[in-house]
Interface confidence: medium
């Protein structure tokens, strides 16, 4: 014979546990129904009556099947430097994240208390470690053979273009400038010779391995107090 389905509340068999979406009520000593997400226990079960559930009030939620006496409060409204990436509903908490280009500079369990703009690396410096939701950009000096001519929170140091003949050598904040190459027998007479790098690299190509004279990685550190262009923030 198939086992009878027990309806809550019921006394569990000795040594057995309550079923999914049920909980054991110590006072009633019965298996009772949990409340669904978006609800909470308004009245706990007894030996003869099951849990009475009620909907969460505005600005409160429960995310799981539960038997809590009151719903959880949604977190504070998002601040002006945050965006609400998940709204407060009866079944989920509000989630605030720092707006694009910003990161969380001070957080607690309740969420981010202060967003700050991502640091911008000045010319001569490139991004060594990109910013995340909770960490700032780390800048590093461009190693010999690489440069960055931007003030940016995303640009890395890029290799200098390689010239046949160098007009102006590159440095940490400027690319090399090539001269026009001398005509060779392989070129048609009268051809226009523009400055021509041997290879072209896209903006986002990783820099070539640094020469042995490059600073060690112990140099990778957040730039210290920096002028506004480098990402420090006022009020």
């Amino acid at each position: 014979l198939p086992a009878q389905v027990a309806f809550t509340p019921y006394a569990p068999e000795p040594g057995s546990t309550c079923r999914l979406r049920e909980y054991y009520d110590q006072t009633a000593q019965m298996c009772c129904s949990k409340c669904s997400p978006g609800q909470h226990a308004k009245v706990f079960c007894t030996k003869t009556s099951d849990t009475v559930c009620d909907s969460c009030e505005d600005s409160t939620y429960t995310q799981l099947w539960n038997w809590v006496p009151e719903c959880l409060s949604c977190g504070s409204r998002c601040s002006s430097d945050q965006v609400e990436t998940q709204a407060c509903t009866r079944e989920q908490n509000r989630i605030c994240t720092c707006r694009p280009g910003w990161y969380c500079a001070l957080s607690k369990q309740e969420g981010c208390r202060l967003c700050a703009p991502l640091r911008k690396c000045r010319p001569g410096f490139g991004v060594a470690r990109p910013g995340t939701e909770t960490s700032d950009v780390v800048c590093k000096p461009c190693a010999p053979g690489t440069f960055s001519n931007t003030t940016s929170s995303t640009d890395i140091c890029r290799p200098h273009q390689i010239c046949n003949v160098v007009a102006i050598p590159g440095n940490a904040s400027m690319d090399a400038v090539c001269t026009s190459t001398s005509p060779t027998r392989s070129m048609a007479p009268g051809a226009v010779h523009l400055p021509q790098p041997v290879s072209t690299r896209s903006q986002h190509t990783q820099p070539t391995p640094e020469p042995s004279t490059a600073p060690s990685t112990s140099f990778l550190l957040p730039m210290g107090p920096s002028p506004p262009a480098e990402g420090s923030t006022g009020d």
């Epitope: 409060s73 504070s76 601040s79 309740e110 208390r113 700050a116």
Partner: antibody, heavy 120, light 111 residues
Framework: QVQLVQSGAEVKKPGASVKVSCKAS????????IDWVRQATGQGLEWIGE????????YYNEKFKGRVTMTRDKSISTAYMELSSLRSEDTAVYYC?????????????WGQGTLVTVSS | DIVMTQSPDSLAVSLGERATINCRAS??????????MHWYQQKPGQPPKLLIY???NLESGVPDRFSGSGSRTDFTLTISSLQAEDVAVYYC?????????FGQGTKVEIK
């Protein structure tokens, strides 16, 4: 306007406990922290800890851990600070203060203070 | 814990003159270009009152003769022209990390 109103003065014996209340009004109680700070007569300010009323999460100064309990009753917008195993050096004015979750990260509104005297 | 040390312990200034209070933290209270340092004023029998938050921001309703400056470990509260009602004890406080800590206070009096 934001207001924090604390319970009245207390006289306690050493070893006893005291529970100070702080009723908030003029803002959404569950949105911001309530901090507790004490000040012995003629002395400076000492931070005891804080509670986030929305979740009930607490952050205690290690110095008071094991002796302090911060709770809240959201239905009446009131925060409580209970200090147990009282000793004479706990005699002080106890203040509650609001600290906004965002922005200032400072205590911008304070209760009037509650004098707790510990004496045998 | 971050230790906050104020100087001087007390200060006597003539009415209309400038008063300067310093506060030094045992380690940096800066994070990402923000200084989590605040200044409070406390008059006898009253709770403290927030004057300056995050090093240099004037709290609403506070007279603009009060100003704050500094970063990392060294901070200053300046009263540009001392008034009789400014007689009080002034405290600095850091909220960069728990436990939040206060300076020992600086008593400002009229000379």
């Amino acid at each position: 306007q934001v207001q924090l109103v604390q319970s009245g003065a207390e006289v306690k014996k050493p070893g006893a406990s005291v529970k100070v209340s702080c009723k908030a009004s003029g803002y959404t109680f569950t949105d911001d922290y309530i901090d507790w700070v004490r000040q012995a007569t003629g002395q400076g300010l000492e931070w005891i800890g804080e509670i986030y009323p929305g979740s009930g999460n607490t952050y205690y100064n290690e110095k008071f851990k094991g002796r302090v309990t911060m709770t809240r009753d959201k239905s009446i917008s009131t925060a409580y600070m209970e200090l147990s195993s009282l000793r004479s050096e706990d005699t002080a004015v106890y203040y509650c203060a609001r600290s906004q979750v965002y922005g200032k990260i400072a205590m911008d509104h304070w209760g009037q203070g509650t004098l707790v005297t510990v004496s045998s | 814990d971050i230790v906050m040390t104020q100087s001087p312990d007390s200060l006597a200034v003539s009415l209309g003159e400038r008063a300067t209070i310093n506060c030094r933290a045992s380690e940096s209270v800066d994070n990402s270009g923000n200084s989590f340092m605040h200044w409070y004023q406390q008059k006898p029998g009253q709770p403290p009152k927030l004057l300056i938050y995050r090093a240099s921001n004037l709290e609403s309703g506070v007279p603009d003769r009060f100003s704050g400056s500094g970063s990392r470990t060294d901070f200053t509260l300046t009263i540009s022209s001392l008034q009789a009602e400014d007689v009080a004890v002034y405290y600095c406080q850091q909220s960069k990390e728990d436990p939040y800590t206060f300076g020992q206070g600086t008593k400002v009096e009229i000379k």
